[in-house]
């Protein structure tokens, strides 16, 4: 004979558990229905009546099947350095993530508690490791033959352009300046003296690590002062 389907509330067999989406009510000593996501238990079950559920009020939610007497409060509105990637609904909490140019310095279970601006590498330094949602940018000095002339959280060190005739040699923070004779490198239309990577790699690709030996040479122009150890600047 097929087993009889029990309707909630019902007393479970000794040693057995309640079914999926049911809970055991200690007071009634019965298996009772849980409330669906977006609802909460308005009236708990008795031996003769099942759980009475009600919808969550505005700015509150339940994400799981539950029997909580009150819905959970949604988190506070996202701060100015954050964007709301998931709105507060009856079934889910608001999720705030860091806006572009920021990273999460202190995370919470979902989303971010505290955002911080991504470090910007100053001229002479390029991005060694790009920032992610949860980690800051790492800067490193541009190695010989490369430069960065920007203060940026995305720009890597690029090679100096190769000139037919050099007017000014490049350094870590400046590209080589060619004389009127055309340089021996493809130039982007309208972009003077900026190297054009052939590949479609974006500037977020793995940058060139600095050579293992501390690089340098003394050239025609006098050596300038050493740059500070850190290559970043504030926002």
């Amino acid at each position: 004979l097929p087993a009889q389907v029990a309707f909630t509330p019902y007393a479970p067999e000794p040693g057995s558990t309640c079914r999926l989406r049911e809970y055991y009510d200690q007071t009634a000593q019965m298996c009772c229905s849980k409330c669906s996501p977006g609802q909460h238990a308005k009236v708990f079950c008795t031996k003769t009546s099942d759980t009475v559920c009600d919808s969550c009020e505005d700015s509150t939610y339940t994400q799981l099947w539950n029997w909580v007497p009150e819905c959970l409060s949604c988190g506070s509105r996202c701060s100015s350095d954050q964007v709301e990637t998931q709105a507060c609904t009856r079934e889910q909490n608001r999720i705030c993530t860091c806006r572009p140019g920021w990273y999460c310095a202190l995370s919470k279970q979902e989303g971010c508690r505290l955002c911080a601006p991504l470090r910007k590498c100053r001229p002479g330094f390029g991005v060694a490791r790009p920032g992610t949602e949860t980690s800051d940018v790492v800067c490193k000095p541009c190695a010989p033959g490369t430069f960065s002339n920007t203060t940026s959280s995305t720009d890597i060190c690029r090679p100096h352009q190769i000139c037919n005739v050099v007017a000014i040699p490049g350094n870590a923070s400046m590209d080589a300046v060619c004389t009127s004779t055309s340089p021996t490198r493809s130039m982007a239309p309208g972009a003077v003296h900026l190297p054009q990577p052939v590949s479609t790699r974006s500037q977020h690709t793995q940058p060139t690590p600095e050579p293992s030996t501390a690089p340098s040479t003394s050239f025609l122009l006098p050596m300038g002062p050493s740059p500070p150890a850190e290559g970043s600047t504030g926002d």
């Epitope: 000095p141 010989p144 050099v166 040699p169 021996t184 052939v198 690089p215 340098s216 040479t217």
Partner: antibody, heavy 129, light 110 residues
Framework: QSLEESGGDLVVPGTSLTLTCTAS?????????MCWVRQAPGKGLEWIAC????????TYYASWAKGRFTVSRTSSTTATLQMTSLTAADTATYFC??????????????????????WGPGTLVTVSS | ALVMTQTPASVSAAVGGTVTINCQAS??????LAWYQQKPGQPPKLLIY???YLTSGVPSRFKGSGSGTEYTLTISGVQCDDAATYYC????????????FGGGTEVVVK
């Protein structure tokens, strides 16, 4: 701009030879390194040495070339490669090539990015008895 | 000493096809890599430097890629004029690392 090598010859083992590189259309003393690269018949390229063609004339050599090969700048448009104790293994076409200089602040040590962007046609050196 | 290992030694391709040449450095050369094209009786010509930057006048069908110790030259839409020997070169020289060339790859176009 162009480079041209001269001085290639047939010489006997154990002798010396000096090759000359002449620059046209640019001044050797303006932000360039002049370098020498050789290529044995039917073989690959082998870098020899470079000289920074300004006052100090700083040089750098392949480890195998130190002692037997000497690069120097003789004028604002010429550089030379002196080779001594030549052997049959030195038989090759010798190219002069240039690479651009740059300055780098705040570093120590010697580092060069050697991209040879301009080459001469080469001069043949044959060492045979 | 730094060793540049270039493969294959020779490759044949039909017009319009694609050729891939690999270059492996015995140590990390930090993208200081150049590619040269050499035709018989001529000096080498610089095609690509700093691993992926094209020199002017070089057709965009030439593409350099790679980092660390592994680098690649790809010629897409091969043309008859591309028949030549190609060399990679570690363009980095320091107190303990010398500039070095790969052994070369002969590209034959059918």
């Amino acid at each position: 701009q162009s480079l041209e090598e001269s001085g290639g010859d047939l010489v006997v083992p154990g002798t010396s030879l000096t090759l000359t590189c002449t620059a046209s259309g640019f001044d050797l003393s303006s932000f360039y390194y002049m370098c020498w690269v050789r290529q044995a018949p039917g073989k690959g390229l082998e870098w020899i040495a470079c000289i920074y063609a300004v006052s100090s004339g700083s040089t750098y050599y392949a480890s195998w070339a130190k002692g037997r090969f000497t690069v120097s700048r003789t004028s604002s448009t010429t550089a030379t490669l002196q080779m001594t104790s030549l052997t049959a293994a030195d038989t090759a076409t010798y190219f002069c090539a240039r690479h651009q200089s740059y300055e780098t602040y705040g570093y120590v040590g010697v580092v060069y990015a050697t991209y040879f962007s301009l080459w001469g046609p080469g001069t043949l050196v044959t060492v045979s008895s | 000493a730094l060793v540049m290992t270039q493969t294959p030694a020779s490759v044949s391709a039909a017009v319009g096809g694609t050729v891939t040449i690999n270059c492996q450095a015995s140590e990390d050369i930090d993208s200081y890599l150049a590619w040269y094209q050499q035709k018989p009786g001529q000096p080498p010509k610089l095609l690509i430097y700093y691993a992926s930057y094209l020199t002017s006048g070089v057709p965009s069908r030439f593409k350099g890629s790679g980092s660390g110790t592994e680098y690649t030259l790809t010629i897409s839409g091969v043309q008859c004029d591309d028949a030549a020997t190609y060399y990679c070169q570690s363009a980095f020289y320091s107190n303990n690392t010398e500039t070095a060339f790969g052994g070369g790859t002969e590209v034959v176009v059918k």
